[in-house]
Amino acid sequence: FGISGKHFITVTTFTSAGNIGEDGTLSCTFEPDIKLNGIVIQWLKEGIKGLVHEFKEGKDDLSQQHEMFRGRTAVFADQVVVGNASLRLKNVQLTDAGTYTCYIRTSKGKGNANLEYKTGAFSMPEINVDYNASSESLRCEAPRWFPQPTVAWASQVDQGANFSEVSNTSFELNSENVTMKVVSVLYNVTINNTYSCMIENDIAKATGDIKVTDSEVKRRSQLQLLNS
């Protein structure tokens, strides 16, 4: 592939995280070329012989693809010509974690960039009022986490309070024997207060909020991937 006299093109990647069992994206962008057949995209993984994925002359070329990625990869074909070389990875596995290289050749030049891909499990927590308990309590549940996260409670009224003495957290292994269900119960809660259940591991941080008043219960939850 002759590119004599051409320059190195800018390739940009973003560290990202994959959720085990779901589809993930390894993000990569580059200085676009105006013609599709001038673009070659290669995805490589450190420690793996063969390619993760190759796209050239407007088509996937999977002749050198490593078997662990067979049938699981795709580029966003319609976005290649505008500089998107991101790779869709189906059914993310724990073993997909590692260092990937996005290598680009165009008629304008060539370039590459690495990205760290973390894999684990993370899910949104849901908080409910547990009326079965002798005193009013809150139950925070999140179905899938890995590695094992930390769980902490906070309250709007009692800011800075340590709730570890009045809460109980358990981790239950899911059927696939990797991810775990997180359950945390907070006891002795008071009405007209907002409580937060925070679940965090080295991949993600999730927060569930609940506001309990005499007349209603309001919930909100959010999930944030770390270092991405």
Epitope: E31, P32, I34, K35, L36, G58, A77, V81, K108
Partner: antibody
Framework: QVQLVQSGAEVKKPGASVKVSCKAS????????MHWVRQAPGQGLEWIAA????????DYNQKFKGKAKITAVTSTSTVYMELSSLRSEDTAVYYC??????????WGQGTMVTVSS | EIVMTQSPATLSLSPGERATLTCKAS??????VAWYQQKPGQAPKLLIS???YRYTGVPDRFSGSGSGTDFTLTISSLEPEDFAVYYC?????????FGGGTKVEIK
Amino acid sequence: QVQLVQSGAEVKKPGASVKVSCKASGYTFTSYWMHWVRQAPGQGLEWIAAIYPGNSDTDYNQKFKGKAKITAVTSTSTVYMELSSLRSEDTAVYYCTTTVAHYFDYWGQGTMVTVSS
Amino acid sequence: EIVMTQSPATLSLSPGERATLTCKASQDVSFAVAWYQQKPGQAPKLLISSASYRYTGVPDRFSGSGSGTDFTLTISSLEPEDFAVYYCQQHYNTPLTFGGGTKVEIK
């Protein structure tokens, strides 16, 4: 929102030159190719050339090499196309168009260049 | 250069009818074809990119298909505002080239 605003209509004599401008706004000017396409009266569309303002890379249709010259000024987010040695066959509407998320997804309003003695 | 041949040159149809426009490339262009609509006195508007991806805001009566050398733009049920000229364009190789256009006119 993305906008491409072109300079006004021009009337030129054969042999003269003309410089048409296209001012971009609403996106990162240096990150996307800007193209020029022309359309003679009652005719189809013809690609002339393109420029990547980030590094001034250009690509020309061989047919227009020596006829068209495109430049980009990043400080004003403006692309220029100069047409030289004008002939009556160069009478056309000249469009600038960019490729942000898809091919030619935004177009200027067009600049009519008339070449007449 | 890659030659894009559109057919028919003119299509005379009534509102509500189905329109099928074809575009043939002189060589394999993978999926690198876009379709544009142009009305008199206006700049072209992108309808379909990468052979089959409907552009934002384009009504779902417009659809594109094909790969390699044969491409089709289909308008499932013509609305009055759909009567215009349609162009296909390849961005597989330079020079980028357009088809000669198909005029969809009211019968």
